[in-house]
Interface confidence: low
């Protein structure tokens, strides 16, 4: 498909001249950021961004690649080096430590320097590193965590927890020996390490004692509470704050977000991770966009400003399943949340960053025609005389042999939300990838986001922009917090 | 491997604070660029950049990812959308038209708007678009093309040619009907469309009549001249310029580059593409770094400045073969050329851009330990109880089944320069990928390189920075060319 207007060189020359004009007008703001938002697309490498752009565009009846994601509109871009101290290809724990705390750690550890060792409880103490969210709270800002995964998952946990094992969601996941040594599960740290004003996502089961039925799935024992210590962490959290509210469904969330008496809000909408956007029951569970909006309504009441972490956490899960349909529809919802946040905040006082913790071994090739489905087939046949999809994985569970050969695929099969794209190597779960990821920035001090940087730079830019420790002498005007 | 110094949070905090300091000091230059250099890594997607960084670092006895490529040091980064008008995933012809001429074209066409149709000679006339190199020449600058492919290949051809078929290297490749309609082969256009001061790369055989033995391979008929029109294009080119010199080996190149009487230089070092860096006979063929240096020595004599195109063109070829070793060693030589150019020019007056035309379905995953070989195996086994490499391809010639199963691989096999990484889909040649690629920028007006842009933006930034058409009223001081 060749759009007639694109045949004319003037179309491209005019468009580029306009882009140049916009570039020339960009003026680095010399002010501090009152508010900080970091949007984290878990596993959202550059190949995912491009494929999601095309899909989002095609959902709006465009050809695809010429359209803009909300994140594409951010004026500054950098590349972020995601390796962990011990691995070329990292996990979401070590990376969360980097972009939220400003220090690189080891694979599968969270909120700890690399002096800590995975799974060795006795290496925790003394190696804790402090997140920007924690520092924002100390500076009098309101803070929030929003995610489509469980709120105790690796990425959000980087904002508040310190653990040598990212899998220690509740005390039932922590070995007795580690519990005896004083290592706390992540759910416990969520309510006790610091005062978080807004907590929205999944993860109900880790907050309640074993045997507590889940309110949404009361007959499913596997969805009920998991805690061995008998604690009801939600109850403990509610008891800490006069204006605290706990909700577990969309209706309650929307009510609470509009209630001026609510100062602290915890919404846990699934026992574990939230459902994929394509499976979400919109009467029961809020979307990431809705959770983001609710969080912003509450947090923006604070005249000193806020820090908000928003994660599209299941982009990663779709990729691990080699189901690109899931990964890309999650990316679109993540981008919708970015767009909504942009409407509810001002780039005059809010530094917004969009990035990924790492990428995936996910590729988009095969020379498909413009306007063809991102989930479709490449033109022509492979060497084995069979069709193949434009989306593929390097490794993952999509690998299958049928009668000792690669199976054929049709356009209708490949377009299914359940279809697993093929891979070169068979794994139970497709792996992360180690290439640099993009950082998109808008707002005060966004111009500092440039070039190729270590992932740790992200936390430091946020801290500097809002004059948080260790950059309290940031020399930016107006100084953060002067509006109260 | 965990470096002891990296266990200390101070290591990361200090490093990030320094990076912040550097970011704060960045001052957009308000001057015009006297010189323009575009470094084009053919097929150099972000995954290639990261993997090459690790390899280059490890060749210097470092762990790898913490090191810097020369391009990593460029202060500004943007993302470039590479699709062609008719394809989501483009080729090197349509993309060359975009980044060199500022207009998007159709797959496999060069220097033509999308009104032209692939292989249809009669759609050429009237649809030609003019490259920045051509405009630089008009403005009195010296211009040059340096590549590791044949100089008539798609990417360099974007600087000087207009053709509906990128494969029309010599007249022997052009159908008689198209020749009768007046469509010229690329080699002819190389010497006749415009005055190019420096031409360095491969492509001898397209310049000489059929039956002309090649000077390096006189006994190999297949390497000799291919032209049917009986023309000796080198002779014709030499006759155009008093100070023109033709060379075909490294010794002659080095001599010519230091000879003040040489005003125009054509060096063609192989009959077709130049050899991969790992196969290069360093007594006969220059490296890309050496060709770049030679070009800069000649071009920098012009007080009005220069335009130089430098292509690491065989990164792409290594990937098409699914031989990551070749792709990554080519990328390192490309980066070495960037580094050398940086030493020979000043960012005060030279705008340098580094980018790729497109990416490849190449991924780097599997959670390898830091410091482990980029060509090595992932820890653990795949679901078929066999080893697998961290580098893999979505599709390509590395696909293989042995007794109806994926073959095992050892570290020594995967480390071989000839090893083809496995892929999900069997193809004769691995395909390009459609995700955005990075643009790195340094020098006057480099700050305009920001955000997510159409690939066409690159040509416009260069034209604007040097006050070339259509931006002659660029309002930058000092205006380009005022030093003569």
């Amino acid at each position: 498909i060749i759009p007639v207007e694109e045949e004319n060189p003037d179309f491209w020359n005019r468009q580029a001249a306009e882009a140049l004009g916009a570039a020339k007008k960009l003026q680095p703001a010399q002010t501090a950021a009152k508010n900080l938002i970091i949007f984290l697309g878990d596993g959202m490498g550059v190949s995912t961004v491009t494929a999601a752009r095309i899909l989002k565009g095609q959902k709006k009846d465009k050809l695809g690649p010429e359209t803009f994601l909300a994140m594409d509109r951010f004026p500054y871009v950098a590349l972020s080096k995601t390796y962990s101290v011990d691995k070329h290809v990292p996990d979401s724990g070590a990376t969360a430590t980097a972009y939220l705390c400003g220090v690189k750690g080891n694979f599968q550890t969270i909120g700890l320097s690399a002096a800590a060792r995975f799974n060795q409880c006795n290496t925790t103490r003394g190696n804790e590193v402090i997140s920007v969210m924690n520092r924002a709270k100390k500076a009098g800002k309101s803070v929030g965590v929003v995610t489509t995964t469980r709120v105790q998952h690796a990425s959000p946990a980087g904002a508040y927890a310190h653990t040598v094992n990212r899998n220690w969601y509740s005390d039932a996941d922590v070995p007795a020996s580690a519990r005896q040594e004083g290592c706390q599960d992540i759910a416990t740290q969520l309510i006790s390490n610091m005062d978080i004003d807004v907590i929205l996502g999944g993860g109900r089961k880790y907050m309640f004692p074993m045997g507590t039925p889940d309110p949404e799935y009361p007959d499913d024992y596997s969805q009920g509470g998991t805690r061995l210590d008998g604690k009801n962490l939600v109850q403990e959290w509610l008891a800490k704050h006069q204006g605290a509210r706990y909700v577990w469904n969309r209706t309650e969330l929307l009510q609470a977000s509009l209630d001026p008496s609510v100062t602290h809000l915890m919404g846990l909408f699934e026992p574990g991770d939230m459902k994929y956007e394509i499976h979400r029951d919109s009467t029961l569970d809020p979307s990431l966009m809705e959770m983001t909006e609710a969080a912003l309504l509450l947090l923006s009441r604070n005249p000193r400003g806020f820090f908000l972490f928003v994660e599209g956490g299941r982009i990663d899960h779709g990729h691990h399943e080699s189901r690109a349909y899931r990964a890309l529809t999650e990316t679109i919802m993540f981008d919708d949340a970015i767009e909504r946040a942009g409407q509810l905040t001002s780039e005059e006082d809010t530094l917004s960053l969009v990035t990924a913790d790492h990428s995936h071994v996910f590729s988009f090739g095969g020379y498909p025609l413009r306007g063809s489905s991102i989930f479709g087939l490449a033109p022509g046949k492979a060497r084995d005389r069979k069709a193949y999809t434009v989306l593929l994985y390097g490794n993952g569970p999509g690998y299958v042999l049928k009668d000792g050969a690669r199976p054929d695929v049709t356009e209708s099969e490949s377009g299914s939300p359940e279809y697993r794209q093929q891979s070169a190597v068979p794994l139970d779960g497709e792996t992360h990838a180690g290439e640099d990821v993009a950082v998109f920035a808008r707002g005060p001090q966004a111009h500092l986001v440039h070039g190729v940087q270590e992932q740790t730079f992200i936390a430091h830019v946020m801290a500097f922009a809002a004059c948080l420790e260790p950059y309290t002498a940031c020399d930016l005007a107006p100084r953060a917090g002067t509006t109260d | 491997i965990i470096p002891v110094e990296e266990e200390n949070p101070d290591f990361w905090n200090r490093q990030a604070a320094e990076a912040l300091g550097a970011a704060k000091k960045l001052q957009p230059a308000q001057t015009a660029a006297k010189n323009l250099i575009i470094f084009l890594g053919d097929g150099m997607g972000v995954s290639t950049v990261t993997a090459a960084r690790i390899l280059k670092g490890q060749k210097k006895d470092k762990l790898g990812p913490e090191t810097f490529l020369a391009m990593d040091r460029f202060p500004y980064v943007a993302l470039s959308k590479t699709y062609s008008v008719d394809k989501h995933v483009p080729d090197s012809g349509a993309t060359a038209t975009a980044y060199l001429c500022g207009v998007k074209g159709n797959f496999q066409t060069i220097g033509l708007s999308a009104a032209a149709r692939f292989n249809q000679c009669n759609t050429t006339r009237g649809n030609e678009v003019i490259s920045v190199m051509n405009r630089a020449k008009k403005a009195g600058k010296s211009v040059g093309v340096v590549t590791t492919t044949r100089v008539q290949h798609a990417s360099p051809a974007g600087a000087y040619a207009h053709t509906v078929n990128r494969n029309w290297y010599s007249d022997a490749d052009v159908p008689a009907s198209a020749r009768q309609e007046g469509c010229q082969d690329i080699a002819t256009q190389l010497i006749s469309n415009m005055d190019i001061d420096v031409i360095l790369g491969g492509g001898r055989k397209y310049m000489f009549p059929m039956g002309t033995p090649d000077p390096e391979y006189p006994d190999d008929y297949s390497q000799g001249g291919t032209r049917l029109d009986g023309k000796n294009l080198v002779q014709e080119w030499l006759a155009k310029h008093q100070g023109a010199r033709y060379v075909w080996n490294r010794t002659e190149l080095l001599q010519a580059s230091l000879d003040p009487s040489v005003t125009h230089l054509m060096g063609l070092f192989e009959p077709g593409d130049m050899k991969y860096e790992i196969h290069r006979d360093s007594t006969l063929d220059p490296s890309l770094m050496e060709m770049t240096e030679a070009a800069l020595l000649l071009l920098s004599r012009n007080p009005r400045g220069f335009f130089l195109f430098v292509e690491g063109g065989r990164i792409d070829h290594g990937h098409h073969e699914s031989r990551a070793y070749r792709a990554l060693t080519e990328t390192i030589m490309f980066d070495d050329a960037i580094e050398r150019a940086g030493q020979l020019t000043s960012e005060e007056d030279t705008l340098s851009l580094v980018t790729a035309d497109h990416s490849h379905v190449f991924s780097f995953g599997g959670y390898p330990l830091r410091g482990s070989s980029i060509f090595g195996l992932a820890p653990g086994k795949a679901r078929d109880r066999k080893a697998y490499t961290v580098l893999l391809y979505g599709n390509g010639p590395g696909y293989v089944l042995k007794d109806g199963a994926r073959p095992d691989v050892t570290e020594s096999e995967s480390g071989s320069p000839e090893y083809r990484q496995q892929s999900a889909v069997p193809l004769d040649g691995e395909t390009h990928a459609g995700e955005d690629v990075a643009v790195f920028a340094r020098g006057p007006q480099a700050h305009l390189v920001h955000g997510v842009q159409e690939q066409t933006f690159i040509a416009h930034v260069m034209a604007f920075a040097a006050c070339l058409e259509p931006y002659t009223a660029c309002d930058l001081a000092p205006r380009a060319g005022t030093t003569d």
């Epitope: 084995d384 | 010639p397 090893y419 083809r420």
Partner: antibody
Framework: QSLEESGGDLVKPGASLTLTCTAS?????????ICWVRQAPGKGLEWIAC????????TYYATWAKGRFTISETSSTTVTLQMTSLTAADMATYFC???????????????????WGPGTLVTVSS | AVLTQTPSPVSAAVGGTVSISCQSS????????LAWYQQKPGQPPKLLIY???KLESGVPSRFSGSGSGTQFTLTISDVQCDDAATYYC???????????FGGGTEVVVK
């Protein structure tokens, strides 16, 4: 799993002959390369041609064999080798063999033949 | 490509070790696509080793292969009477026209 060649005969110089390779216990649609290799009396092995099973149409020939020899898949269990303009130099035992790999270029087939037929003798004499 | 093998015959004592070399005029594909076949009179060849050093199933571990690029060796240790045969190397190359077998090396067991 086995292979068996047939069609070997005594023919005069200049004649044509078709050899057949029949598979038992597997079929060619399982995507194997099937190759013909010959061995002149008292001499070494010489690769002739390969075909990729499964009606793919992919064939590869030794330079000397192209034009005079044609390899074809005639059914899911039979592959033939048509030989024309036979000379005394073509007198040999002809083997058909299956590649170890179900996916490899034929370029490598000679180095991966793990299932062979017993051979069939072609004699060229006037 | 031309594959040159150790000239025939090569003598080996029972229980001893024998090595046969194979030199290729150009590098085999992936530097390892070289195989060794054993052929006894009146029988078809039998694949012993593929990809330089990988033992085909059912082949005794007394047979081993080594080498890379253009130089390869087949080693038979603890030689048995049953090992008396002609051994051929065969190379796979990046172009099918270069596919070839070596001339063969006869091993005589005493």
């Amino acid at each position: 799993q086995s292979l068996e060649e047939s069609g070997g005969d005594l023919v005069k110089p200049g004649a044509s002959l078709t050899l057949t390779c029949t598979a038992s216990g597997f079929d060619f649609s399982s995507y194997y390369w099937i190759c013909w290799v010959r061995q002149a009396p008292g001499k070494g092995l010489e690769w002739i041609a390969c075909i990729y099973g499964g009606s793919s149409g992919s064939t590869y020939y030794a330079t000397w064999a192209k034009g005079r020899f044609t390899i074809s898949e005639t059914s899911s269990t039979t592959v033939t080798l048509q030989m024309t303009s036979l000379t005394a130099a073509d007198m040999a035992t002809y083997f058909c063999a299956r590649s170890l790999y179900t996916w490899r270029y034929a370029d490598y087939a000679a180095s991966t033949l793990n299932l062979w037929g017993p051979g069939t003798l072609v004699t060229v004499s006037s | 490509a031309v594959l040159t093998q150790t000239p025939s015959p090569v003598s080996a004592a029972v229980g001893g070790t024998v090595s046969i070399s194979c030199q290729s005029s150009q590098s085999v594909y992936n530097v390892n696509l070289l195989a060794w076949y054993q052929q006894k009179p009146g029988q078809p060849p039998k694949l012993l080793i593929y990809e330089t050093s990988k033992l085909e199933s059912g082949v005794p571990s007394r047979f081993s292969g080594s080498g890379s690029g253009t130089q390869f060796t087949l080693t038979i240790s603890d030689v048995q009477c049953d090992d008396a045969a002609t051994y051929y190397c065969a190379g796979g190359y990046s172009s099918s026209k270069d596919n070839s077998f070596g001339g063969g090396t006869e091993v005589v067991v005493k």
